[in-house]
């Protein structure tokens, strides 16, 4: 019996087609992805093949103005239109709190939404009961397939799930559900979830009875043969893991942003054992036409976005200096504003020991593309912020050793004075440079804001300590020459859309007046 698994993950609000790098589509003839194009390909496969499942491994939420405006209603609407068979909850599905998940998505989705390792407690337990499930058994042709979901246990540190959801260890939570499915006579089981490729592989190895793992969170690109675009494969598709009980378990992921449609064919014997698996992600480029009815629907939903982008988010009573003459040479107040917003967006998990789990931000000055003039009645709009942060990136959470941070700050000024983009703006950090010294030895003082303290204060950076830092995904991926971050980071979790982080902060503060205050000397 042959099953075709079509899968997406980390789509992050890319409902419209995008450019090759998943930013805003400029030249339509070279654009990719989007739900209209995805629908064309899915329908083509559904017509050609008998047993097809369309699955999403989480993080549909967060990433473009679509999510900012529609807050998840767009996800439910278009996933329903594409007739997804199941979705796993990702960490970003909690970005607007549990209510922001329940109302727009859980109550509106016509497909099961899954996670076995999220347990509700207290008053939320009855409110959310039945709206998401640990597993679902789906009829596929004359057979049935069990889908069991999982979500990163780090979600409380990455999003806003509140205090009434407990995120258990994935493997511990999955095993009893898989055992139950097996005992219920379900002999073909897919683990669908959002914890990253390393955890996906562990699940394949450790959870008895899982036949296939369809993952997300780490934006992993797997491919067999010559890759069709810019993404470099992290391994073959499918990636085969030998389980502890000796089975060959295929593990797949389909990069991110709806650029690819994962396509995996699995052959099962009559006892539900995997005999063979093969496939590849399908690049959703312009050779695949956009479905006209879905495209028309997208255009209808688009209208509200255009109206939103000119509405006032808040006011500034000072000039927001985002000029390259400032932000690439010295502390600039636009950099301070953005870093403050980045930290504010990550305020969660205070306890007796920690006032917050992260206090530090770094931001490449070259990523700040425009100032905002306060003389336009002080008004700040989404449109203004899109000029400041035009690349459609995310502000991510990483864990780095102090020694790596020191290298990053040396890199920040290694060729100071040439208006290059690597000069770092900061938050929760005080740095002193001596530019008379030779490159690689210019950082003379580097103090960082404590987190394990009731009164935050600045302490000298410790080389062997592990720190959490918020930074643009561009830096996490080694951009602007920050190869040491990419090579030495100990953990990387993708965060929220950059413009959304700043716009939310400005809306919250209502009136802003960021200063230059001696963070960089």
């Amino acid at each position: 019996w042959e099953l075709t698994i079509l899968h997406t993950n980390d789509v992050h609000s890319r409902l419209e087609q995008t450019s090759e790098d998943s930013s805003k589509c400029v030249n339509a003839s070279r654009c990719m992805g989007g739900v209209a194009r995805l629908f064309t390909k899915v329908q083509q496969i559904r017509r050609a093949e008998p047993n097809v499942l369309l699955l999403d491994a989480g993080d549909q939420y967060q990433g473009t103005i679509w999510f900012t405006v529609y807050k998840g209603a767009e996800v439910a609407h278009f996933m329903n239109a594409l007739r997804y068979d199941a979705m796993a909850l990702g960490n970003h599905e909690f970005d607007n709190g549990v209510e922001g998940l329940i109302e727009p998505l859980l109550k509106e989705a016509k497909f099961p939404i899954l996670s076995a390792n999220i347990k509700a407690k207290g008053p939320l337990a009855s409110q959310i009961s039945g709206l998401y499930l640990p597993y679902k058994v789906l009829p596929v042709g004359d057979e049935v397939v069990g889908i069991v979901g999982y979500t990163s246990k780090e979600t409380p540190f990455l999003s806003n799930p509140g205090t009434n959801l407990v995120f258990e260890d994935e493997i511990t939570a999955l095993q009893p559900e898989v055992d139950k499915l097996k005992t219920l006579n379900v002999n073909k089981i897919i683990a669908l979830g959002h914890s990253g490729f390393e955890t996906d592989k562990l699940i394949a190895q450790k959870v008895r009875g899982v036949d296939v793992v369809v993952g997300g969170h780490s934006n992993t690109f797997l491919y067999t043969g010559n890759p069709p675009s810019k993404e470099v494969p992290a391994g073959k598709y499918p990636f085969i893991v030998t389980s502890d009980d000796g089975r060959k378990v295929p593990v797949v992921q389909a990069y991110a942003f709806g650029k690819y449609l994962g396509y995996l064919k699995i052959e099962f014997d009559e006892r539900g054992n995997v005999i063979s698996s093969h496939g590849n992600p399908i690049l959703l480029n312009s050779s695949i036409p956009e479905d006209p009815s879905i495209k028309a629907d997208i255009n209808k939903w688009r209208i509200k976005l255009d109206n939103y982008s000119t509405q006032e988010l808040g006011k500034t009573i000072v000039y927001l200096d985002g000029s390259s003459q400032s932000c690439r040479f010295r502390e600039c107040n636009m950099g301070n504003l953005i870093c403050d917003a980045m930290i504010n967006n990550n305020l969660r998990h205070a306890d007796e020991m920690f006032w917050n789990h992260v206090s530090m931000c770094i931001l490449n000055g070259g990523g700040i593309r425009s100032p905002i003039d306060e003389r336009n009645n002080g008004t700040i709009t989404w449109e203004n912020l899109a000029a400041v942060l035009p690349f459609g990136g995310t502000f991510d959470l990483v864990q780095l050793k102090g020694s790596t941070l020191k290298k990053a700050f040396e890199h920040s000024v290694h060729r100071y004075g040439q208006s290059t983009g690597e000069f770092l703006q900061v938050g929760g950090i005080h740095v002193v440079y001596d530019l008379s010294r030779k490159p690689g030895d210019r950082v003379v003082k580097l103090d960082v804001l404590c987190t394990k303290c009731r009164v935050p204060s600045y302490d000298p950076l410790k080389m062997d300590e592990i720190y959490k830092v918020i930074l643009p995904n561009f830096l996490a991926n080694g951009g602007d020459g920050f190869q040491m971050i990419k090579d030495e980071l100990l953990r990387h979790d993708s965060g929220d859309q950059d413009i959304n982080v700043v716009s939310t902060y400005i809306s919250k503060m209502k009136v802003i007046y960021p200063a230059v205050e001696g963070r960089i000397k």
Epitope: G130, V137, V144, K180, T183, N185, N187
Partner: antibody, heavy 120, light 107 residues
Framework: EVQLLESGGGVVQPGRSLRLSCAAS????????MHWVRQAPGKGLEWVAV????????YYADSVKGRFTISRDNSKNTLYLQMNSLRAEDTAVYYC?????????????WGQGTMVTVSS | DIQLTQSPSSVSASVGDRVTITCRAS??????LAWYQQKPGKAPKLLIY???SLQSGVPSRFSGSGSGTDFTLTISSLQPEDFATYYC?????????FGGGTKVEIK
């Protein structure tokens, strides 16, 4: 012929134990999850317990949890139900049933039943 | 636990009549419902599995329908041997549960 044959029923005092057996024939026993279902006199059907094909995973009705243990010996094609701390409300005809080969579980083969009476 | 409510609890009918029995689940169980027939002193017999699939050897006058929470067993033309008690059963989750039964009696 596909067949299930229960044995071991009888009259027993409250608080005592009893072990039921179910001998299977005519099919590959170790391919199937096996169940016990009971029926109190004049009442409806009540599912009691299940054991998976390998004998690893077991699930019980709340009414018997901690008192009854389901087990199987695939080499002998036999299913068991060890019943401890018996109560008057456990009085019923006990059926062993095959859970079918596919999902959803539907009991496609039943034994003829064995009567258990718990009485002082 | 998933509760199954059968109605009616009993029905009087004549040979040749069309008889409909309903089963309502306390939560969504997709199509994972079975129907059984039981005659006095006998073990139950499987009629329908997966809400609408007829078990082999069962006459085609028996049919099942429904999904989610509402299910129906229909006997299109009642025969003398059909007078019995009928049970629904869910297998969406453990514990497996049965409906309370519907007794079909001769009018």
């Amino acid at each position: 012929e596909v067949q299930l044959l229960e044995s071991g029923g009888g009259v027993v005092q409250p608080g005592r134990s009893l072990r039921l057996s179910c001998a299977a024939s005519g099919f590959t026993f170790n391919f199937y999850g096996m169940h016990w279902v009971r029926q109190a006199p004049g009442k409806g059907l009540e599912w009691v317990a299940v054991i998976n094909d390998e004998g690893i995973n077991k699930y019980y009705a709340d009414s018997v949890k901690g008192r009854f243990t389901i087990s199987r010996d695939n080499s002998k094609n036999t299913l068991y139900l060890q019943m401890n701390s018996l109560r008057a409300e456990d009085t019923a005809v006990y059926y062993c049933a095959r859970g079918g080969a596919r999902y959803p579980i539907a009991f496609d083969i039943w034994g003829q039943g064995t009567m258990v009476t718990v009485s002082s | 636990d998933i509760q199954l409510t059968q109605s009616p609890s009993s029905v009087s009918a004549s040979v040749g009549d069309r008889v409909t029995i309903t089963c309502r689940a306390s939560q969504d169980i997709s199509s994972w419902l079975a129907w059984y027939q039981q005659k006095p002193g006998k073990a139950p017999k499987l009629l329908i599995y997966a809400a609408s699939s007829l078990q082999s050897g069962v006459p085609s006058r028996f049919s099942g329908s429904g999904s989610g929470t509402d299910f129906t067993l229909t006997i299109s033309s009642l025969q003398p041997e059909d007078f019995a008690t009928y049970y629904c059963q869910q297998a969406n989750d453990f514990p497996i549960t049965f409906g309370g039964g519907t007794k079909v009696e001769i009018k």
